[in-house]
């Protein structure tokens, strides 16, 4: 067991003339947040796999306005450390993904709104109990500097935190088959804890926090007898010994769920019970409280003062699921007329309008374009005695005033979660889905129906939408 | 502007070493690391390692790793590498690059060093 | 060490041509790919950092999008200038790794 610790030092524009404007302003003024995403960078795991070994969500940053004029200076930063804890061994290889969000604190209805700004990504190698590693990376404009480490918790120890010491007994020496622990020489090798409640006649351990059966013996504790006496319908290959199928390997075999998540199989594949305090598909995610934020979408969190206590959120009109992730469509009630196109913006509805008709519902008819002005390199079209801007790439609305949000057309298919992003959207898929926009089924066995052709974009990957 | 100057071109005998210079100016010397890729004769690019300005850590490429040193002086924010052993294969151009461990925005106008007995 | 496999490796073209280089990552590497252009005799120019994003100073002719492990620079309008090798490579694994180079030539 250990700690993986991430320490920011800066977010700031990267150098040059094509430095971005702050992302905060003195109408809307803003404040930073980062989360990180840990996985064993060796494994086999598809792009939008979860953090199996864990993640976490800084605090929020000081709050911060602009100065007119100014160029986007570093931002200012959460204070601490992010710090994702691991229950097993440290896997030496790791994979990252750190995230810089934007909460911005203006008076949109609902709350404040959050945005990704940047994320980076990166496959290191880490040795447990080693210094600090250092980090330079660039995500479109912006550039993060940051040092991680890992470290063991006593009584682990090692590159791997697989080895377990404790004080001696005697002051002599270790006991029998033990040596002492290098370099704590005055401490001495533990014998291997396996996994809590791991039988002791039927199981036996070779790392810490694990549980191997003995033959005959089954179960994530080998509590369970291997049945010979009905050879129905198993799922293995025939043993010789006993001419009977033994069971082979189940989804839920070795219980792939973290922090003492119960596994039930389930006709596709498992499913985890978390306990209290631990969310994720494999219960990786855990002591969330209110202060990590889980509410998206301006949701007051409320309860959940402490990691071991439930939190609820409680979502602004127009959101919904239990960390009002997901948006009600009303645009079904189709309130824009005359063929407008209705656009929901979580805070708001808005109605784009066709060629000759404008208004907050496209109710009013349109002169052409005679003393009509279209905003930011728009250009206005005539037709009919009617008139519309044509927008530059990235603006809307009426008069090209508005930046376009590429979310509105709800790209994420299968309740996938949309975020604006600096290159244009990202999609974070629900459980089960994967793709560029999450319209690829993930298959029980890992594979997935992605087309044999070059597959696009892995979910929550950045792409431009244009 | 930002600049990296390189020293001149070097004619080395095999098992020999030799030290190449880069010069940064333009920008805080500290800020960023400073990279070494280096190209044979019609070949591509190949990354030997980087060094870090401000805390000396260096990181270097499996095949280079027992033969490469990288040192620096923040007096003249100059940065060295030197290749041991020397070989025929390590003939190549040597070039520095200024960057972090995704990007390397500016790159040094390159060292051609010859081994040959 | 993570392979890049850049096609085509030789290309010709005319000026005012839009051109499409590929770059073909091993595994997924997210988008940690940059582009280079290499003149004879020159050091590598960055184009193009995480995937998509242009250097300062870049001419917009230049674009590249793509992620995971399938990559692509497309260069709208071919320049004289343009004519070039161009390289891409991998930054999300230690060692950096280059694909092997796409020289573009006057038709």
């Known amino acids: 067991a250990g700690v993986f610790e991430l320490q920011i030092h800066s977010f700031g524009p990267g150098p040059g003339p094509g430095a971005p404007r702050s992302p905060c302003s003195a109408r809307l003024p803003c404040r930073l947040f980062f989360r990180v995403c840990l996985k064993p960078g060796l494994s086999e795991e598809a792009a939008e796999s979860p953090c199996a070994l864990g993640a976490a969500l800084s605090a929020r940053g000081p709050v911060y306005t602009e100065q007119p004029g100014a160029p986007a200076p570093d931002l200012p930063l959460p204070d601490g450390l992010l710090q994702v804890p691991f229950r097993d061994a440290w896997p030496g290889t790791f994979s990252f993904i750190i995230e810089t969000w934007r909460e911005e604190l203006g008076d949109q209805i609902g709350g404040p709104a959050w945005s990704l700004l940047a994320r980076v990504a990166g496959r290191r190698r880490l040795a447990a109990g080693g210094p600090w590693a250092r980090d330079i990376q660039r995500a479109g404009a912006w550039e993060l500097r940051f040092s991680y480490r890992a470290r063991c918790e006593p009584p682990a120890v090692g590159t791997a935190c697989t080895r377990l010491c404790r004080p001696r007994s005697a002051p002599s020496r270790c006991g029998p088959g033990l040596r002492p622990c290098a370099p704590l020489e005055d401490e001495c090798e533990a014998p291997l804890v396996c996994r809590a409640g791991c039988s002791p006649e039927h199981g036996f351990c070779e790392q810490p926090g694990e549980c191997r059966c003995l033959e005959g013996w089954t179960g994530p504790l080998c509590t369970v007898p291997v049945s010979t006496s009905s050879c129905l319908s198993p799922r293995g290959p025939s043993s010789a010994t006993t001419g009977c199928l033994v069971p082979g390997p189940g989804p839920c075999d070795g219980n792939p769920c973290a922090n003492g998540g119960s596994c039930s199989e389930t006709p596709r594949s498992f499913e985890c019970t978390c306990p209290r305090g631990f969310y994720g598909l494999r219960c990786e995610v855990s002591g969330v409280t209110c202060a990590d934020g889980p509410c998206f979408n301006g949701g007051l969190c409320v309860g959940g003062a402490d990691p071991d206590s439930a939190y609820i959120c409680h979502c602004p009109p127009g959101f919904q699921g239990s960390n009002c992730e997901k948006r009600v469509d009303r645009c079904s009630l189709q309130p824009c007329r005359n063929g407008g196109l209705c656009l929901d913006l979580g805070h708001a509805l808005r109605c784009r309008c066709r060629a000759g008709f404008a208004g907050p519902r496209c109710e009013h008819d349109l002169d052409d374009c005679a003393g009509r002005a279209c905003a930011n390199g728009g250009t206005c079209v005539e037709g009919g005695g009617a008139h519309r801007c044509s927008c530059a790439l990235g603006f809307g609305g009426r008069d090209c005033r508005e930046r376009a949000d590429p979310c509105a057309a709800r790209p994420c298919a299968h309740g996938g979660r949309c975020y604006a992003h600096f290159s244009g959207l990202v999609c974070a898929c629900a459980p089960g889905y994967m793709g560029a926009r999450c319209e690829f089924p993930v298959h029980p066995d890992g594979a997935s129906a992605l087309p044999a052709a070059p597959p696009g974009l892995r979910p929550g990957d950045p792409q431009r939408y244009l | 502007q930002v600049q990296l100057v390189q020293s001149g071109a070097e004619v080395k005998k095999p098992g020999a070493s030799v030290k190449v210079s880069c010069k940064a100016s333009?920008?805080?010397?500290?800020?960023?690391?400073i990279h070494w890729i280096r190209q044979a004769p019609g070949q591509g690019l190949e990354w030997m390692g980087y060094?870090?300005?401000?805390?000396?850590?260096?990181e270097f490429h499996q095949n280079f790793k027992d033969r490469v040193t990288m040192t620096r002086d923040t007096s003249t924010s100059t940065v060295y590498m030197e290749l041991s052993s020397l070989r025929s294969e390590d003939t190549a151009v040597y070039y520095c690059?200024?960057?972090?461990?995704?990007?390397?925005?500016?790159w040094g106008q390159g060292t051609t060093v010859t081994v040959s007995s | 060490a993570i392979q890049l496999t850049q096609s085509p490796s030789s290309l010709s073209a005319s000026v005012g041509d839009r051109v499409t280089i590929t770059c073909r990552a091993s595994?997924?590497?997210?988008?940690?790919l940059a582009w280079y252009q290499q003149k004879p005799g020159k050091a590598p120019k960055l184009l193009i950092y995480?995937?998509?994003s242009l250097e300062d100073g870049v001419p917009s002719r230049f674009s590249g999008s793509g992620s995971g492990t399938d990559f692509t620079l497309t260069i709208s309008s071919l320049q004289p200038e343009d004519f070039a090798t161009y390289f891409c490579?991998?930054?999300?694994?230690?060692?950096?790794?280059f694909g092997g180079g796409t020289k573009l030539e006057i038709k």
């Open positions: 490579k991998q930054a999300y694994d230690v060692p950096p790794t």
């Open positions: 595994e997924n590497i997210y988008y940690n």
């Open positions: 690059a200024r960057g972090g461990s995704n990007f390397f925005d500016y």
């Open positions: 333009g920008y805080t010397f500290t800020r960023y690391w």
């Open positions: 995480t995937a998509n």
């Open positions: 060094i870090n300005p401000t805390t000396v850590y260096t």
